[in-house]
Interface confidence: low
Amino acid sequence: NIDVCKLGTVTVQPAPVIPLGSAANISCSLNPKQGCSHYPSSNELILLKFVNDVLVENLHGKKVHDHTGHSSTFQVTNLSLGMTLFVCKLNCSNSQKKPPVPVCGVEISVGVAPEPPQNISCVQEGENGTVACSWNSGKVTYLKTNYTLQLSGPNNLTCQKQCFSDNRQNCNRLDLGINLSPDLAESRFIVRVTAINDLGNSSSLPHTFTFLDIVIPLPPWDIRINFLNASGSRGTLQWEDEGQVVLNQLRYQPLNSTSWNMVNATNAKGKYDLRDLRPFTEYEFQISSKLHLSGGSWSNWSESLRTRTPEEEPVGILDIWYMKQDIDYDRQQISLFWKSLNPSEARGKILHYQVTLQEVTKKTTLQNTTRHTSWTRVIPRTGAWTASVSAANSKGASAPTHINIVDLCGTGLLAPHQVSAKSENMDNILVTWQPPKKADSAVREYIVEWRALQPGSITKFPPHWLRIPPDNMSALISENIKPYICYEIRVHALSESQGGCSSIRGDSKHKAPVSGPHITAITEKKERLFISWTHIPFPEQRGCILHYRIYWKERDSTAQPELCEIQYRRSQNSHPISSLQPRVTYVLWMTAVTAAGESPQGNEREFCPQGKAN
């Protein structure tokens, strides 16, 4: 803060506002009878320079004129843009202990004259809005600069508004507060912007426009849609618009889409028919308006209308598969499975499925509806059976999909050859095969079916399957494939009335099993030891087990154990070993091996064979 200048005055020449690059002379004068007491000649006037309230320079060496004890003039150069504060102080040199006393101060502003404003743009939002213009001010002036926006038009129409820019606010837009009405549609208006500050002034070029050039219609409102006869694909979009609108742009898309459908509508009068909608789909609709076919600006997009189109009857074909299990000599259980239609095929909420099992020759028909995607029935083992399934929503049902029930693995000649399963990554398995060698009927299609090899998976979980054309010999299976789980994979070759299959196990990722098999019993029969075990719990297998290892060694021996490997069979849980010495106590344990390595050992059991050595 500058004290009120009681001791003296500070003046600036040529002025306190100067152009960039100019010098200024600052004079500091003491008032009469002010200064250091008794010794006027000891008065020393000093000038201090402050930027942003920080002392940056003592201008002692810049004196250009000095009336000792009365006044001093300092020349300041190289001032930076913006405001600089200079404070004159009195230093009484005979009193070293007293600090200099402020005399007076002055602020010098360094800036530039304004450039002519450019790129004037005016808009009026809606027929009842007001005209607002914006412009580019050019380089920052670093000075308070006044801007005047002037509009002139027909019938001696004139109007102006002002604003200013300084270091706290920027002025590059003004609302004139007047409304241009449609009856002036053909009239021409001129605006210009004038900028003035202490260093000069400038004016923009005149900017000419018409009503149509600047009026941006308000976005349409009250948007709604009517679906003709509850159609899921045809609807009439309706909306409200300002009276002068002649052109509309419509855009619409399903909610999960990334690209809009665009439509231009001339003289729509707030109504437009859409014919290509997808049934039972959430859509977003927006509309924009324009007042003139060729000129003018589009309004902002309206608020979105979000709605779902009505249902229509399902289309498409269900993907059906089945399992066949003999119950006894004259009955079999048929389990039908099918995949849900995708939304574009379902075209609504599927309420139920119509399932039919028909014996072709005897014309026996079993029918049922179910809300599930599977259906199980017990039927006679005799006769040729066919199944069909259709999906129904509130508007109707899809065409039934038929499948012949054949013995899926009944024909060895139709069994695919050289089936392999390779892990591709964490989520999928590549299955490849060769066609049947001596098929006596043409392969119509291959079905690759897979199921996790876990207890109860056949009864608890439906199979997963892929239909493969007859000329393809590979499939990448990914649905419900998880790492560290073993799957039984079957490749079926189907002809019109027969089926053959080959099976393999595979996993998408494997680790060594967490634990080894648990030995439950060791029995001696005919000089051989039978080792019985329980399998590793399914989650701890961590992939497909390739084989088991049975280890044995003499109880107190430090030698490496002996071992035998047994190929993994889910149904097998005992195995004989021989060549053990009688009346020697052995320690036995088991491990399991996957493609990733060996499990830790299972429990240890001791056993002392009694029989003769082999």
């Epitope: 998880k482 790492p483 560290y484 680790k511 967490v514 634990s515 989650p539 701890e540 961590r542 830790p600």
Partner: nanobody, 126 residues
Framework: QVQLQESGGGLVQAGDFLRLSCVFS????????MGWFRQAPGKEREFVAA????????QYAEAVKGRFTISRDNAKSTVYLQMSSLKPEDTAVYYC???????????????????WGQGTQVTVSS
């Protein structure tokens, strides 16, 4: 990418109890077994407790048996460690760990767990 976030640590008196939580994200929680480990200053990370994906099998380090209980809520994708009768020697950073496999046996080394949280500090004052 699996992420684990522990919470619930703090400063307690000896004999008090504390419940740690670990929220799992970025995968299917029900496919993972979960474990708690701890690491005291200057010591190696050591096993505390583990629980199978289904929650039907649990294991504990000898030092915490009878005092700590591990549990899980598959609906909330969260595993808990209820700690009671806390002792000063329980002071450590407690880490939550996850792995698609569940190891049964004494060798619960940290290397058997694939995914780890950042840890939560538990300090037990005497």
């Amino acid at each position: 990418q699996v992420q684990l976030q522990e919470s619930g640590g703090g400063l307690v008196q000896a004999g008090d109890f504390l419940r740690l939580s670990c929220v799992f994200s970025g995968g299917t929680f029900g496919d993972y077994s979960m474990g708690w480990f701890r690491q005291a200053p200057g010591k190696e990370r050591e096993f505390v407790a583990a629980i199978r994906w289904s929650g039907d099998s649990t294991q504990y380090a000898e030092a915490v048996k009878g005092r700590f209980t591990i549990s899980r809520d598959n609906a909330k994708s969260t595993v808990y460690l209820q700690m009671s009768s806390l002792k000063p020697e329980d002071t450590a950073v407690y880490y939550c760990a996850a792995d698609p496999s569940y190891y049964i046996g004494p060798n619960h080394t940290p290397s058997r767990y694939r995914d780890w949280g950042q840890g939560t500090q538990v300090t037990v004052s005497s």
